[in-house]
């Protein structure tokens, strides 16, 4: 599949960081999604957990980001073996654990996809 | 020893510029989103503008009454934030602080820890 | 533009509880971070994200927000606290920052 460049990871980065500064109330009344695997494929992963949170505004760019990044078409109810299907965490968690990860993969230029 | 230490504070006429400069030690401070915060004399604190770190974006953002005047900078290379302060005012006299931005703190390696500079004077008379 | 609001000033009694209130339409999702200003000196963060307090910062010193209103408690208010205090926090949007008008502690020695 296509790997994000350089400049797609810093866009996803800096709408990570916008929807999470100084937020302490719950983003998006505190829905649930599955924990994934922080590691190659993790866009698709990532993807495929959020899209099963609906009518939720502040996350709506960073769903078509990482549609942009993901190279199949993901539906909601759509799970790969990527995800820890046993452990489900806030949303406002996930976000932040995907930030942390992509920040680290765009520091050591390794943009997995 | 962490600080921040200003410079470039001075007497300017209305109308003028003046670039102020805040140099950075003891921190990552490529890794900080910084501040500019301003106190007019006998007044309150106001917050002036922020920047974040370039992995967050470097993205800039500035409270209304100078937005389209002045502008923030940073040279991590120089672990060194800057202000460019054009069309400057009256109303612009204050003592100017940089300080660590406390909502990046979050993002960077210093969450729970606050540097100030010692403020540097800008006088904006005729 | 967004604004959060505190009291002019606030008096009490050595080893009496101090309480500043700072208001502010975000303030429910929003963190608030509080700062103490002695005379001639910059500002010290005395507690961040409503109620943490920084290292080195007096256990006296505790924050806690509840809706649109945060609030600084100084438990067995001392000389030494007298000083400026400032709410700072953001917009809704997290982008813009502000701070209070602030308050003046005075402790009546």
């Known amino acids: 599949g296509p790997v994000p460049p350089s400049t797609a990871l810093r866009e996803l980065i800096e709408e990570l960081v916008n929807i999470t500064q100084n937020q302490k109330a719950p983003l998006c009344n505190g829905s649930m999604v599955w924990s994934i695997n922080l590691t190659a494929g993790m866009y698709c992963a990532a993807l495929e957990s959020l899209i099963n949170v609906s009518g939720c505004s502040a996350i709506e760019k960073t769903q078509r980001m990482l549609s942009g990044f993901c190279p199949h078409k993901v539906s909601a109810g759509q799970f790969s073996s990527l995800h820890v299907r046993d452990t489900k965490i806030e949303v406002a968690h996930f976000i932040t654990k995907l930030l942390s990860y992509t920040k680290q993969l765009f520091r050591h230029g390794q943009q997995f996809n | 020893e962490v600080q921040l230490v200003e410079s470039g504070g001075g007497l300017v006429k209305p109308g003028g510029s003046l670039r102020l400069s805040c140099a950075a030690s003891?921190?990552?401070?490529?890794?900080?989103?910084m501040s500019w915060v301003r106190q007019a004399p006998g007044k309150g604190l106001e917050w002036v503008g922020r920047?974040?770190?370039?992995?967050?974006?470097?993205?800039?953002n500035y409270a209304a009454p100078v937005k389209g005047r002045f502008t923030i900078s940073r040279d991590d290379s120089k672990n060194t934030l800057y202000l460019q302060m054009n069309s400057l005012k009256t109303e612009d006299t204050a003592v100017y602080y940089c300080?660590?931005?406390?909502?990046?703190?979050?993002?960077?390696?210093?969450?729970?820890?606050?540097?100030w500079g010692q403020g540097t004077t800008v006088t904006v008379s005729s | 533009s967004y604004e959060l609001t505190q009291p002019p000033s606030v008096s009490v009694s050595p080893g009496q509880t101090a309480r500043i209130t700072c208001s502010g339409d975000?303030?429910?999702?929003?963190?608030a971070y509080w700062y103490q200003q002695k005379s001639g000196q910059a500002p010290v963060l005395v507690i961040y994200?409503?109620?943490k307090r920084p290292s080195g910062i007096p256990e006296r010193f505790s924050g806690s927000s509840s809706g649109t209103m945060a609030t600084l408690t100084i438990s067995g208010a001392q000389v030494e606290d007298e000083a400026d205090y400032y709410c700072?926090?953001?917009?809704?949007?997290?982008?813009?920052?502000?701070f209070g008008g602030g308050t003046k502690l005075t402790v009546l020695g």
């Open positions: 300080a660590t931005d406390q909502v990046g703190a979050y993002y960077g390696d210093y969450y729970g820890m606050d540097v």
């Open positions: 975000a303030l429910p999702e929003k963190y």
């Open positions: 003891g921190f990552t401070f490529s890794n900080a989103w």
């Open positions: 920047i974040r770190s370039e992995i967050d974006g470097g993205t800039t």
């Open positions: 994200e409503d109620s």
């Open positions: 700072h926090s953001t917009d809704s949007s997290g982008n813009h920052g502000v």
